[in-house]
């Protein structure tokens, strides 16, 4: 058993049929010694008396808010949560496996630049009685500071018969140098509590590996005289690290119709303009990627050909 | 990167071109190592990230773009020792900090070159003959060092008398290649920045 936060405790349980469970001793936070009784949740049934209560925690029915009272007055609370371990593996029931970039990916993180700011998100089908708490650091043995905000519900989607909820959090490394060469990864830890179930999820990464620039901005077309070709130009996204001559991007320019199966024109360039063939009912799209370290491409920025 | 090959800038351009070749060569070699040594811990997640130049050179600090010198987090350990000018910059562009930066890059390359050559000598003794260093990568390191043209004492190649542990050597190769790729990215950024200045 360990303390998650004040008056909230996590009991780690090996979860299998007829498991013996864990013996837990609760102590009432009071100078009083006599006349103390214990109840669980909303029930008025007295579970025991005295300053301490010993319980055998085996299942979710044994978890919950234990309260000690004296003469009708509440003295203190202890909330017990369960963390299940099945076949030596901690449960991951609360969050959905995003399976990208590999199986057992519950947390996904992205950074728009090298400033040390990044966003992580996760998915769940649970809509109520759900709380998250996020901590992060650079390295684990001698951790350096990373400050994370509160996790918020950022999107709701319908997937078949189910509703899916996306939560996200923004974090900022306390003293980040955009030009630094990372040798210690960022560690992100998410505590998830659903009703009386506790789970934790972690992710470890280098900022350089989670870079995904914003799409290029200000796409403009200039038809070329006596030609099917158009010159398309764009600018670096505002959120990209500066100076751009140091943090350079490379671009992919594509002309395609509405369907992915349609024919296309595609060219890669390090410049902020390119010449392509425009077709009726097609769009010109441009996306960006770090020129020197191939992490993710940005989303496409598009303009219609006409 | 977009300058025509026929008329390179007499200043930075040769170094820019060589640094691009360097990054391509080390990325290629790292990819090859990851494929060939698929049953060894050779991915970024599996290896320890070591920097053999740590406390010996200060490339990131010495080559920091002017725009980032206002960022206190980038200024932990800027060194200011005098280093003579290399040939990559036309003299009108040369400044004390640039010379220090290019000299630091040169020292990085020299250290990695020694490590890679020592390692290759060991890998050549491996009866499995599983992996060797790409001669192109070694040649590209050499070309960039020549383009930088700093005078510096030659570092003797390390020789070891004991029987090499090939498993450890291959893991060290992965560690070295990951670190060198990161440094090659920095070098490429620096050359691109200096070329644009």
């Amino acid at each position: 058993i360990w303390e998650l936060k004040k008056d909230v405790y996590v009991v780690e349980l090996d979860w299998y049929p007829d498991a013996p469970g864990e013996m837990v001793v609760l102590t009432c936070d009071t100078p009083e010694e006599d006349g103390i009784t214990w109840t669980l949740d909303q029930s008025s049934e007295v579970l025991g008396s005295g300053k301490t209560l010993t319980i055998q925690v085996k299942e979710f029915g044994d978890a919950g808010q234990y309260t000690c009272h004296k003469g009708g007055e509440v003295l203190s609370h202890s909330l017990l949560l369960l963390h299940k371990k099945e076949d030596g593996i901690w449960s991951t029931d609360i969050l959905k496996d995003q399976k990208e970039p590999k199986n057992k990916t519950f947390l996904r993180c992205e950074a728009k630049n090298y400033s040390g700011r990044f966003t992580c998100w996760w998915l769940t089908t649970i809509s109520t009685d759900l709380t998250f708490s996020v901590k992060s650091s650079r390295g684990s043995s001698d951790p350096q500071g990373v400050t994370c905000g509160a996790a918020t519900l950022s999107a709701e989607r319908v997937r078949g018969d189910n509703k899916e909820y996306e939560y996200s959090v923004e974090c900022q490394e306390d003293s980040a140098c955009p030009a630094a060469e990372e040798s210690l990864p960022i560690e992100v830890m998410v505590d998830a509590v659903h009703k009386l179930k506790y789970e934790n999820y972690t992710s470890s990464f280098f900022i350089r590996d989670i870079i995904k620039p914003d799409p290029p901005k200000n796409l403009q077309l200039k038809p070329l005289k006596n030609s099917r070709q158009v010159e398309v130009s764009w600018e670096y996204p505002d959120t990209w690290s500066t100076p751009h001559s140091y943090f350079s991007l490379t671009f992919c320019v594509q002309v395609q119709g509405k369907s992915k199966r349609e024919k296309k024109d595609r060219v890669f360039t390090d410049k902020t303009s390119a010449t392509v063939i425009c077709r009726k009912n097609a769009s010109i799209s441009v996306r960006a990627q770090d020129r020197y370290y191939s992490s993710s491409w940005s989303e496409w920025a598009s303009v219609p050909c006409s | 990167r977009n300058l025509p090959v026929a008329t390179p800038d007499p200043g930075m351009f040769p170094c820019l071109h060589h640094s691009q070749n360097l990054l391509r060569a080390v990325s290629n070699m790292l990819q090859k190592a990851r494929q060939t040594l698929e049953f060894y811990p050779c991915t970024s997640e599996e290896i320890d990230h070591e920097d053999i130049t740590k406390d010996k050179t200060s490339t990131v600090e010495a080559c920091l773009p002017l725009e980032l010198t206002k960022n206190e987090s980038c200024l932990n350990s800027r060194e200011t020792s005098f280093i003579t000018n290399g040939s990559c910059l036309a003299s009108r562009k040369t400044s004390f900090m640039m010379a220090l930066c290019l000299s630091s890059i040169y020292e990085d390359l020299k250290m990695y070159q020694v490590e890679f050559k020592t390692m290759n000598a060991k890998l050549l003794m491996d009866p499995k003959r599983q992996i060797f260093l790409d001669q192109n990568m070694l040649a590209v390191i050499d070309e960039l060092m020549q383009a930088l043209n700093f005078n510096s004492e030659t570092v003797p190649q390390k020789s070891s008398l004991e029987e090499p542990d090939f498993y450890k050597t291959k893991i060290k190769l992965c560690i070295l290649l990951h670190a060198f790729r990161i440094r090659a990215v920095t070098i490429d950024r620096v050359m691109s920045y200096l070329n644009a200045s």
């Epitope: 099917r228 070709q229 490379t250 199966r261 349609e262 024919k263 296309k264 024109d265 595609r266 060219v267 890669f268 360039t269 390090d270 010449t275 063939i277 077709r279 009726k280 | 990167r1 977009n2 300058l3 025509p4 090959v5």
Partner: antibody, heavy 118, light 107 residues
């Protein structure tokens, strides 16, 4: 299977015009760009131009501008290359090639030898 | 027009050898470069697109690399069926242009 089948060999006199065909099968003809590339004996490959069969848009290499016409007939799924004012240096194998991407060549015809000789 | 220069123009090698062919562009073409194999009397066949992207059905012993002006095609362990002529082609701008070709012949 995506296939391009070209018409047979031609022998032409200098100054004449040649028209070769390229019949597509195994895909929707207008879904791919169609290019023509030639190869003189013991020489390299030379791109001549492309057509978008969907709308008839064409683009030609400056070297052949004014002498070459590329057309496409969507009713027969056939592309054509017409080269006029033939000279001996036009002796070559002419290939049609197709792709959903405009700038490289995924599927090739078997080639048509055009000999220009007096 | 962008000139593409291939080297060497021919290379003699044995089965099992590692062969590298290079291609240089007269100006930067990013990764807009493709490789083809051509056997005598046959049409070319696409091997690699955009400098390093593999083509389905092409053996993994063929690999491409490079960007900007310098590119290479490597055949890792030469097989009897690999003796042919190889061409690079740039797609950075029109007109599309090819390298002069490299003949890989039996030693």
């Amino acid at each position: 299977e995506v296939q391009l089948v070209q018409s047979g060999a031609e022998v032409k006199k200098p100054g004449a015009t040649v028209k070769i065909s390229c019949k597509a099968s195994g895909y929707t003809f207008s879904d791919y760009y169609l290019h023509w590339v030639r190869q003189a004996p013991e020489k390299g490959l030379e791109w001549m131009g492309w057509i978008d069969p969907e709308n008839g848009d064409t683009e030609y290499a400056p070297k052949f501008q004014g002498r070459v016409t590329i057309t496409a007939d969507t009713s027969t799924d056939t592309g054509y290359l017409e080269l006029s004012s033939l000279r001996s240096e036009d002796t070559a194998v002419y290939y049609c090639a197709a792709n959903k991407e405009l700038r490289y060549f995924d599927v090739w015809g078997q080639g048509t030898l055009v000999t220009v000789s007096s | 027009d962008i000139q593409m220069t291939q080297s060497p123009s021919s290379v003699s090698a044995s089965v099992g050898d590692r062969v590298t062919i290079t291609c240089r562009a007269s100006q930067s073409i990013s990764i807009n470069l493709h490789w083809y194999q051509q056997k005598p009397g046959k049409a070319p066949k696409l091997l690699i697109k955009f400098a390093s992207q593999s083509i389905s059905g092409v053996p993994s012993r063929f690999s491409g690399y490079g960007s900007g002006t310098d590119f290479s095609l490597t055949i890792n362990s030469l097989q009897p069926e690999d003796f042919a002529r190889y061409y690079c082609q740039q797609s950075n701008s029109f007109p599309l242009t090819f390298g002069g070709g490299t003949k890989v012949e039996i030693k």
